[in-house]
């Protein structure tokens, strides 16, 4: 029940996380003007990953798509990527975890096969989470270097008599989405994995013939060299597979006066 | 088209209050414009106020700040100017105008003259 | 506050003669954003209201003739009424849009010599 509720949580959250990673690739204030020295301005600019816009006070707005693809600076196309896999795996992710759900059945999928899935779409939503907060990040980097840029030459005069305002730009709502939003897909992510574990089905497939004995139980192994003795089998059923191999870990031997060399 | 039409008194007495209504006809006050006041004394030139915008926010000239209040009647399509503690200085022809694209003024009320005088 | 200067004060052209309103913005009125100019032109006859001939310095206003042009950019700023006409006497204004208060100019007075 905590496995089904942890892995349903974990597709929520990634799910909100995935959306808001969206919304903020699309959405338009990824910089906007800094208005810390003019709270109220009559002309306001803000930019986003495929378009800048200006905002009249009078009401009037305006947006410019960015056209030019080789013109653009190489972070701004960094950061596109960087969202656009991020989306693209929280995407396939999504997509994975739904069929992976246990409270959703299809065919006969074994709990085997919904535990790999899950676990798949737990890794999508960690790398799409990563992807989105780096973006943001390498986003935000760009913002802080060129806002003390333009604040050291903010003024420039024209012979002392005419006063040209550089425009700054400072974090725009979409950093902020951007940042949360990956931070859920992240969140997301790290749930389905712990899901994942639960999910992993109990070892119950055995393909070996057990003899009990009075005084020791004794499994025959078909292909294996060795006997366990009741003194060192182990309690937990574990999978045995075709062959009967298994590692040192799996089967402790201990001596006893069954044992052969 | 918008149209604009200011109405109120065309004398006032000094230190009292300016009050001026404009009357919007041919759009809604709701809509995406700023609603403007401009006067210009006789033979003079033009002084903007201040503005009421859509969401119903306002923003003055510093020079008249503390005197001026610009509102709003949504119900009857109306915005309207007050100027307190009004001086002969204040004698002026007031328009009421419309900004848009630009921050421009795109449409004009015919205005009205406003004498301060005992 | 930006103060905008117009020169001349006023101005005598012959009918059908080139006509140069200059006005200068004690800054710049260029927004970085969109690459335009907050400025607009208006015409005033007497006894009515002003009328919006240009605004973004340049983009002429609907139903304006096309013998009214605007150019400049930054702080220094033109109106050119390219062939005059009877009905063109009025005193012209312009206006900065980028930063408050809104400032006018004081006005040229165009008149036909």
């Known amino acids: 029940m905590a496995v089904t509720a942890c892995q349903g949580l974990g597709f929520v959250v990634s799910l909100i996380g995935i959306a808001g990673i969206i919304a903020a690739t699309c959405m338009d204030q990824w910089s906007t003007q800094d208005l810390y020295n003019n709270p109220v301005t009559a002309v306001f600019n803000y930019q986003g990953l495929w378009r800048s816009c200006v905002r009249e006070s009078s009401g009037f707005t305006e947006c410019r798509g960015y056209f030019t693809l080789l013109g653009l600076p190489a972070m701004l196309q960094a950061v596109r990527a960087l969202m656009i896999v991020g989306i693209v795996l929280g995407a396939i992710g999504l997509l994975v975890s739904i069929f992976a759900l246990k409270c959703i059945r299809i065919g006969s999928m074994e709990d085997s096969a919904k535990a790999n899935m899950t676990l798949t779409s737990g890794i999508m939503f960690i790398v799409s989470g990563l992807c989105a907060i780096a973006g943001v990040s390498v986003f935000a980097n760009m913002l802080v270097t060129n806002f003390w840029m333009s604040t050291a030459n903010m003024y420039t005069g024209m012979g002392g008599m005419v006063q040209t305002v550089q425009t700054r730009y400072t974090f725009g709502a979409a950093l902020f989405v951007g940042w949360v939003a990956g931070g859920l897909t992240l969140i997301g992510g790290v749930m389905m994995c712990i899901a994942c574990r639960g999910l992993a089905p109990e070892e119950t497939n055995y393909k070996a013939v057990s003899y009990h004995a009075s005084g020791h139980s004794v499994a025959y192994k078909p292909g294996g060299f060795k006997a366990s003795t009741g003194f060192g089998s182990n309690t937990k059923n574990k999978k045995i597979y075709d062959g009967g191999a298994r590692t040192e870990d799996e089967v402790q031997s201990y001596p006893s006066k069954h044992d052969y060399v | 088209q918008v149209q604009l039409q200011e109405s109120g008194p065309g004398l006032v007495k000094p230190s009292e209050t300016l009050s001026l209504t404009c009357t919007v006809s041919g759009g809604s006050i709701s809509s995406n414009y700023a609603w403007n006041w401009i006067r210009q004394p006789p033979g003079k030139g033009l002084e903007w106020i201040g503005y009421i915008n859509y969401s119903g926010y306002t923003n003055y000239n510093p020079s008249l700040k503390s005197r001026v209040t610009i509102s709003r009647d949504t119900s009857k399509n109306q915005f309207s100017l007050k100027l307190s503690s009004v001086t002969a200085a204040d004698t002026a022809v007031y328009y009421c105008a419309t900004s848009y694209y630009g921050n421009s003024f795109i449409y004009w009320g015919q205005g009205t003259l406003v004498t301060v005088s005992s | 506050d930006i103060v905008m200067t117009q020169s001349p004060d006023s101005l005598a052209v012959s009918l059908g003669e080139r006509a140069t309103i200059n006005c200068k913005s004690s800054q710049s009125l260029l927004n970085s954003g969109n690459q335009k100019n907050y400025l607009a032109w208006y015409q005033q006859k007497p006894g009515q209201p002003p009328k919006l001939l240009i605004y973004w310095a340049s983009t002429r206003e609907s139903g304006v003739p096309d013998r009214f042009s605007g150019s400049g950019s930054g702080t220094d700023f033109t109106l050119t009424i390219s062939s005059l006409q009877a009905e063109d006497v009025a005193v012209y204004y312009c206006?900065?849009?980028?930063?408050?208060?809104?400032?006018f100019g004081q006005g040229t007075k165009v008149e036909i010599k």
């Open positions: 206006q900065q849009a980028y930063s408050f208060p809104w400032t």
